[in-house]
């Protein structure tokens, strides 16, 4: 009934990041999270199944936000974060027992969300097998306040890459269309 392995791994990832790994001061620095394709990860073609990419990225993302202090800052600001959007590009399969690394990076932020990237890199040849992007929406505070809390001063956000800007535009257009469909244009807003 419960996904016990998920419920064990997530807090373990947070505790490992908080207690055993050094704090990362540079918010935009890439972080690396190791993994290996297990039999339980496979689909019928003996490749890592698509859902596992999101799941592994979940652990890596939580570890990343812990190590750079964002989750701690959110706790102090009595705020929290939810995943508002994600997209994945699969370039090559990961196979049984293949070692890989999830390389996470904070790409930037706007007035409501942080944007993160997770690259699944095969440790056999360094190939980027999958690229995932995430819009991490903040509730109860703003990204600017979180960054200011961490850096002790106001920090201009980095420029978002052009392809990410297109994805943000797509998400906005999608939100508007769904609101129009529901006839809720002025009533509720997506995250």
């Amino acid at each position: 009934l419960l996904d016990v392995w998920y419920l064990v791994r997530l807090p373990c990832a947070v505790l490992r990041a908080r207690l055993l790994q050094p704090r990362v001061r540079d918010l935009l620095a890439e972080q690396r999270f190791p993994g290996r394709v297990l039999p339980s990860d496979l689909d019928l073609l003996l490749h890592m199944n698509n859902a596992r990419y999101l799941r592994e990225a979940d652990f890596a993302r939580v570890a990343h936000l812990t190590r750079c202090g964002v989750l701690g800052a959110l706790r102090q600001l009595r705020a929290h974060t939810v995943l508002a959007a994600s997209c994945a590009r699969h370039r090559r399969s990961l196979r049984l027992l293949e070692p890989f690394e999830v390389r996470t990076r904070l790409l930037g932020w706007d007035d409501r969300a942080f944007y993160l990237e997770a690259r699944f890199v095969s440790l056999r040849d360094g190939f980027v097998c999958a690229l995932l992007r995430f819009r991490q929406h903040l509730l109860g505070t703003s990204p600017e306040r979180v960054v200011q809390h961490l850096c002790q001063r106001r920090v201009e956000p980095p420029e978002l890459p052009a392809d990410l800007q297109h994805w943000i535009s797509y998400n906005e257009a999608s939100s508007q269309l769904l609101r129009m469909e529901s006839g809720l244009s002025d009533v509720t807003k997506d995250q």
């Epitope: 540079d26 918010l27 935009l28 620095a29 890439e30 990076r105 790409l107 990237e117 850096c151 001063r153 920090v155 201009e156 956000p157 980095p158 420029e159 890459p161 052009a162 392809d163 800007q165 297109h166």
Partner: antibody
Framework: PVQLQESGPGLVKPSETLSLTCTVS????????WSWLRQPPGRGLEWIGY???????NYSPSLKSRVTISVDTSKNQFSLKLNSVTAADTAVYYC??????????????WGQGTMVTVSS | DIQMTQSPSSLSASVGDRVTITCRAS??????LNWYQQKPGKAPKLLIY???SLQSGVPSRFSGSGSETDFTLTISSLQPEDFATYYC????????FGQGTKVEIK
């Protein structure tokens, strides 16, 4: 190898519009940022702005109100228009290719530059 | 705007000298910093990207270091062809250059 070549008038009158074109040869205009920069005589480098092949632009805050950069993918060209010029806009104008890779955004290929003088 | 402050603005050195140029950003820019070399009448040439990575074809006597706000370009043993002006440039948000450091023959 990819090469960039600026073209346009070398003399522009004050209050008029400066127009330059950069032709990209030896490669496609897709998948890069295409930038304009300038360097007044004896001074440092100043970035003007860039365009992505899809049409996304980003301009220097100090020049934003006067600048338009456009791209013509069919001709492998991108262009600069700078309105209401003054003598302070006299400079060598460079076009450059910028890698759009996060953490590696660099001007890796430059044109040889074209001198533009603003004078009546 | 993010301001880039380079120092010194000029320096005199001899062939074989170790030369260090510093660049300071007005706010954190992670490692989004590049170094260029420019000779009179020529377009700038990329030396170092991402604060410390050497561009291919650039001699290994050039090196870069730093992160967040403070960065350094080092030429370990100055060669005759290295007399030029050097610029740092941030690509964190918009693009801004330092005012340049002119390396002259002593």
């Amino acid at each position: 190898p990819v090469q960039l070549q600026e073209s346009g008038p070398g003399l522009v009158k004050p209050s008029e519009t400066l127009s330059l074109t950069c032709t990209v040869s030896g490669g496609s205009i897709d998948s890069y940022y295409w930038s304009w920069l300038r360097q007044p005589p004896g001074r440092g480098l100043e970035w003007i702005g860039y365009i992505f092949y899809s049409g996304i632009t980003n301009y220097s805050p100090s020049l934003k109100s006067r600048v338009t950069i456009s791209v013509d993918t069919s001709k492998n060209q991108f262009s600069l228009k700078l309105n209401s010029v003054t003598a302070a806009d006299t400079a060598v104008y460079y076009c450059a290719r910028e890698l759009p890779v996060i953490g590696r955004r660099t001007f890796d290929i430059w044109g040889q530059g074209t001198m533009v003088t603003v004078s009546s | 705007d993010i301001q880039m402050t380079q120092s010194p603005s000029s320096l005199s050195a001899s062939v074989g000298d170790r030369v260090t140029i510093t660049c300071r950003a007005s706010q954190t820019i992670s490692t989004y910093l590049n170094w260029y070399q420019q000779k009179p009448g020529k377009a700038p040439k990329l030396l170092i990207y991402a604060a410390s990575s050497l561009q291919s074809g650039v001699p290994s006597r050039f090196s870069g270091s730093g992160s967040e706000t403070d960065f350094t370009l080092t030429i370990s043993s100055l060669q005759p062809e290295d007399f030029a002006t050097y610029y740092c440039q941030q690509s964190y948000n918009a693009r801004t250059f330092g005012q340049g450091t002119k390396v002259e023959i002593k």
